[in-house]
């Protein structure tokens, strides 16, 4: 009976996600058969989050909208380890929007999920950010410094990275 009600709960939770994520990839967390963590297929997972590389070229606003209709946000990078994971799936000749912007052009950078901007946990390329009209952040590859962040004009279409919390069922 307990297993039946658990299964019913799982099914109703899965139905919530079905519109945008018809397929989920789930793994068992720990030793308890009750705990499964899922990411939409073909998103990748790292720690408690799921990631999706969007290859459509969009402005920053539309990239964020694209993530939001999938129940996600543009990526908020919290640690070096997280960035190291993300870059494994990126192409060196492309740039990708992050969930980081400076809407007023006053160098008050803010993350889309309101995570406080911590200058000590940023990975700007040297000399960046460097232009008050460039109010959105991308991650890209420079041969001299490998992967890092750059400020660019928000209307220039780029690829993007979406991030959402894992789905626990």
């Amino acid at each position: 009976n307990f297993m039946y009600s658990k299964t019913v709960k799982r099914l109703s939770k899965l139905r919530e996600y079905q519109q945008y994520h018809p397929s989920l990839t789930c793994v068992m967390e720990g030793k308890d058969i009750e705990d499964w963590s899922c990411c939409p297929t073909p998103w990748t997972s790292f720690q408690s989050s799921c990631y999706f590389i969007s290859t459509g070229m969009q402005s920053w606003t539309k990239s964020q909208k694209n993530c939001s209709v999938m129940g996600a946000d543009l990526v908020v990078i919290n640690t070096r380890e997280e960035q190291d994971f993300i870059i494994q799936n990126l192409k060196r000749n492309s740039s990708y929007f992050l969930g980081l912007s400076d809407p007023g052009g006053r160098r008050h950078w803010q993350w889309v999920d309101q995570t406080p901007y911590n200058e000590n946990v940023t990975f700007w390329h040297s000399g960046e950010p460097n232009n008050l009209d460039e109010r959105c952040a991308i991650i890209n590859f420079r041969s001299s410094e490998e992967w890092g962040w750059n400020d660019i004009h928000c209307h220039v279409p780029q690829k993007s990275i979406c991030k959402m919390k894992k789905i626990y069922i």
Partner: antibody, heavy 118, light 107 residues
């Protein structure tokens, strides 16, 4: 007032290149991105790509990739669109357009007719 | 790439008529749609953006509606200066494609 003034009409031979200019005035040149759109005679409109004058960042329509190059000269507030390996189907009026804060084309150049003929 | 299908390709109408032009996208463009008016030998002029927001200086007889993939431009009472070609364009992702155009002619 905002103005985009384009260079004059050009006649080119197949295989040649053409470089069309678009001079901006009446606003801060490096604050807005510029797009290029073309229109073949009696036909519809086709988006070619965009350039951000502040850094020179570009994004091109894949259809033109390898043939189109967009550049800018901040000292003269001018953007350029160069199309190479011209063929007769490239005969068109080429327009530059500014993307406004609302992310739509709010101002357009007057257009430049490029004729490709042997 | 998102394709934009505009209909009709041409129509004949009289001054004072109500005119409706439709634009269908091949995918959801989330209201990121513009409508332009173009007269012969001139550059297009922005009429509406975000599917329904009137651009500066555009008369209120022009209106837009729609969502998802289907959008409409309406001219409530056609004026002599409205005879022109109208284009839709999406701005969801590149390439920012245009509809094929609708030529509004005098009946």
């Amino acid at each position: 007032q905002v103005q985009l003034v384009q260079s004059g009409a050009e006649v080119k031979k197949p295989g040649a290149s053409v470089k069309v200019s678009c001079k901006a005035s009446g606003y801060t040149f490096t604050s807005y991105i510029i797009h290029w759109v073309r229109q073949a005679p009696g036909q519809g409109l086709e988006w070619m790509g965009t350039i951000y004058p502040g850094s020179g960042d570009t994004s091109y329509n894949q259809k033109f990739k390898g043939r189109v190059t967009m550049t800018r000269d901040t000292s003269t507030s001018t953007v350029y669109m160069e199309l190479s390996s011209l063929r007769s189907e490239d005969t068109a009026v080429y327009y530059c357009a500014r993307m406004g804060d609302n992310e739509y084309f709010d101002y357009w150049g007057q257009g430049t007719l490029v004729t490709v003929s042997s | 790439d998102i394709q934009m299908t505009q209909s009709p390709s041409s129509l004949s109408a009289s001054v004072g008529d109500r005119v409706t032009i439709t634009c269908r996208a091949s995918g959801n463009i989330h209201n990121y749609l513009a409508w332009y008016q173009q007269k012969p030998g001139k550059a297009p002029k922005l009429l509406l953006y975000d599917a329904e927001t009137l651009a500066d200086g555009v008369p209120s007889r022009f209106s837009g509606s729609g969502s998802g993939t289907d959008y409409t431009l309406t001219i409530s009472s056609l004026q002599p200066e409205d005879f022109a070609t109208y284009y839709c364009q999406h701005f969801w992702s590149t390439p920012y494609t245009f509809g094929g155009g609708t030529k509004v002619e005098i009946k």
